[in-house]
Amino acid sequence: KIVLDPSGSMNIYLVLDGSDSIGASNFTGAKKCLVNLIEKVASYGVKPRYGLVTYATYPKIWVKVSEADSSNADWVTKQLNEINYEDHKLKSGTNTKKALQAVYSMMSWPDDVPPEGWNRTRHVIILMTDGLHNMGGDPITVIDEIRDLLYIGKDRKNPREDYLDVYVFGVGPLVNQVNINALASKKDNEQHVFKVKDMENLEDVFYQMIDESQSLSLCGMVWEHRKGTDYHKQPWQAKISVIRPSKGHESCMGAVVSEYFVLTAAHCFTVDDKEHSIKVSVGGEKRDLEIEVVLFHPNYNINGKKEAGIPEFYDYDVALIKLKNKLKYGQTIRPICLPCTEGTTRALRLPPTTTCQQQKEELLPAQDIKALFVSEEEKKLTRKEVYIKNGDKKGSCERDAQYAPGYDKVKDISEVVTPRFLCTGGVSPYADPNTCRGDSGGPLIVHKRSRFIQVGVISWGVVDVCKNQKRQKQVPAHARDFHINLFQVLPWLKEKLQDEDLGFL
């Protein structure tokens, strides 16, 4: 498989058959698949060097792995997008052997002197062809030469099979399956041959191709493949319930932010709640996690403005649940990204020198910001798309807080909507879905560059639009939701999570 190890070295060779038998639409589809693959790999913070070859009678090398920009995913994607099927129109035979020889030439080194680290570089060839080579001879001989060059299968104690993967995608109206199978790698419990119909569900294909065992701790990563569970798609999501004898129980959500901490809303708990009465589950697992302590933001005080006629005051409504035992990350349990951390800088593919302010400008610009939250409906987790009103609609969004029960007598809305809040909901630019009571404490998320970054914690809503946890279809335009802006509670997060190796900026 393609081992996505951010500390490893990898060359990926994209080889695309542009011969007569492929056809323009299949060529375009294959290109799209490769663009998606480049993006998927880049989302892991891995920067492989790319080689890009198209071929028919002759190969054409568009990107060499030795080029300075070959590890710049955006630049490689641009080169790929600029390739036309017509480029090979005049010489449209199929010489797959020559194309693979072009790959071999990129792999080999001058004067037979291998560069430092050659033996630690993994090589991945992704060949998109119909397998109908009609000139140049059998391409399998070049695969053998490549294996020889990379010293694969020659050393009994160190076969190095994981240093070469050859994936073949069968594209075109007629595919020679025998030829395609012959070229692809053969490894136990791995799939290296894919058909056209597989390309309709690329996430399923990538799931077969990618080994992410070296990058399970990456924040904000998800798998969207069809066989995935809700927690493959939202692996950070935590379910919290507080059992209060004779008072029933409170349900909330939270987000895994590190191996020991879940971030949630402070209002989910009271000072009387004991640790043993708080149940937290992650990854869709039945068992509950043991709680060491719940850490409230020191400025949170729900009764802080009672004397001013404000029954409930949600400023600084954030809490961290510290777990007794370290979480074991996997595909259904992994952290979400937090603002102003090194992990988020890498997730957004920003320069290492990026400041907290620059992250804020990237994630929360002064405009309507597309975001999402995760809600449970009929035992299923679903993503709800909302817009954070952070531009010209911010004021009107915040003013609608006056319609909240108990806030109708508030003279100045800034008494309840402090600078700590982000506002969503309403009908412009789109009708936003609203949060339900059980969504409290869950993350408000910005999805960028295939990664998920938490910008807020769901706190309170103006209208209870969820009778019996069922969202009503018709809701008033003033149905707004308020979320604690994580950029505003960073000093506290940084202090409490200082041992979690998150690299706060």
């Epitope: 037979d112 033996n119 010293y151 050393d155 009994r156 104690k157 160190n158 190095r160």
Partner: antibody
Framework: EVQLVESGGGLVQPGGSLRLSCGTT????????MSWVRQAPGKGLEWLGF??????????EYAASVKGRFTISRDNSKNTLYLQMNSLKTEDTAVYYC????????????WGQGTLVTVSS | EIVLTQSPATLSLSPGERATLSCKAS??????????MNWYQQKPGQAPRLLIY???NLESGIPARFSGSGSGTDFTLTISSLEPEDGATYYC?????????FGQGTKLEIK
């Protein structure tokens, strides 16, 4: 056809130095471990060390009995293996063989004919 | 280092007889499902010749009367029906752990 030919043996005084060479033909030299083995008169075989193949950067490994005194090196452009022997002792008197160590199964599948080194005053 | 002990030190048998040579290792020479034990034949004045690799695999060009068996620490070289030319010294050698080591050898005499 695989061939290994040792050279450089002879008479040397205790404390002296000698460099043995092993020229090879018939195979891709850099892809193989290459070993030195010796046999004292009337005694058994003693492995002295090897030079690993290209994946391991041709790094050497030595038997404890010669570590620090003997050095194994290779010139891949000449397909030749070397054994530099310093501070020689009378007990180093032996026939010295070079052998191709096949990483496909970690066995010495081809041997040279040997070269005799005599350490004596 | 791994010490290899061969027995018997010498063996005297007639042509057509079966020869069984033993080699015991001070610790296992197995790695990842393979036994890294090799057998060599050496005749006087000649270089050693590989007979068996990885405990039981016959090197090409070696007569089928030679066979190897064993795993872990106990290994056997068997010559099913001795020929006059089999008179030689036989060495076992392990290549599982560095440094490589040889047994002290078994001298086989043909009567």
């Amino acid at each position: 056809e695989v061939q290994l030919v040792e050279s450089g043996g002879g008479l040397v005084q205790p404390g002296g130095s000698l460099r043995l060479s092993c020229g090879t033909t018939g195979f891709t030299f850099r892809d193989y471990y290459m070993s030195w083995v010796r046999q004292a008169p009337g005694k058994g075989l003693e492995w002295l060390g090897f030079s690993r193949h290209r994946v391991y950067g041709y790094t050497p490994e030595y038997a404890a009995s010669v570590k620090g005194r003997f050095t194994i090196s290779r010139d891949n452009s000449k397909n030749t293996l070397y054994l530099q022997m310093n501070s020689l002792k009378t007990e180093d008197t032996a026939v010295y063989y070079c052998a191709r160590d096949n990483p496909g199964y970690y066995a010495m599948d081809y041997w040279g004919q040997g070269t005799l080194v005599t350490v004596s005053s | 280092e791994i010490v290899l002990t061969q027995s018997p030190a010498t063996l005297s048998l007639s042509p057509g007889e079966r020869a069984t040579l033993s080699c015991k290792a001070s610790q296992s020479v197995d790695y990842d499902g393979d036994s890294y034990m090799n057998w060599y034949q050496q005749k006087p004045g000649q270089a050693p010749r590989l007979l068996i690799y990885a405990a039981s695999n016959l090197e090409s060009g070696i007569p089928a009367r030679f066979s190897g068996s064993g795993s872990g620490t106990d290994f056997t070289l068997t010559i099913s029906s001795l020929e006059p030319e089999d008179g030689a010294t036989y060495y076992c050698q392990q290549s599982n752990a560095d440094p490589y080591t040889f047994g002290q050898g078994t001298k086989l005499e043909i009567k």
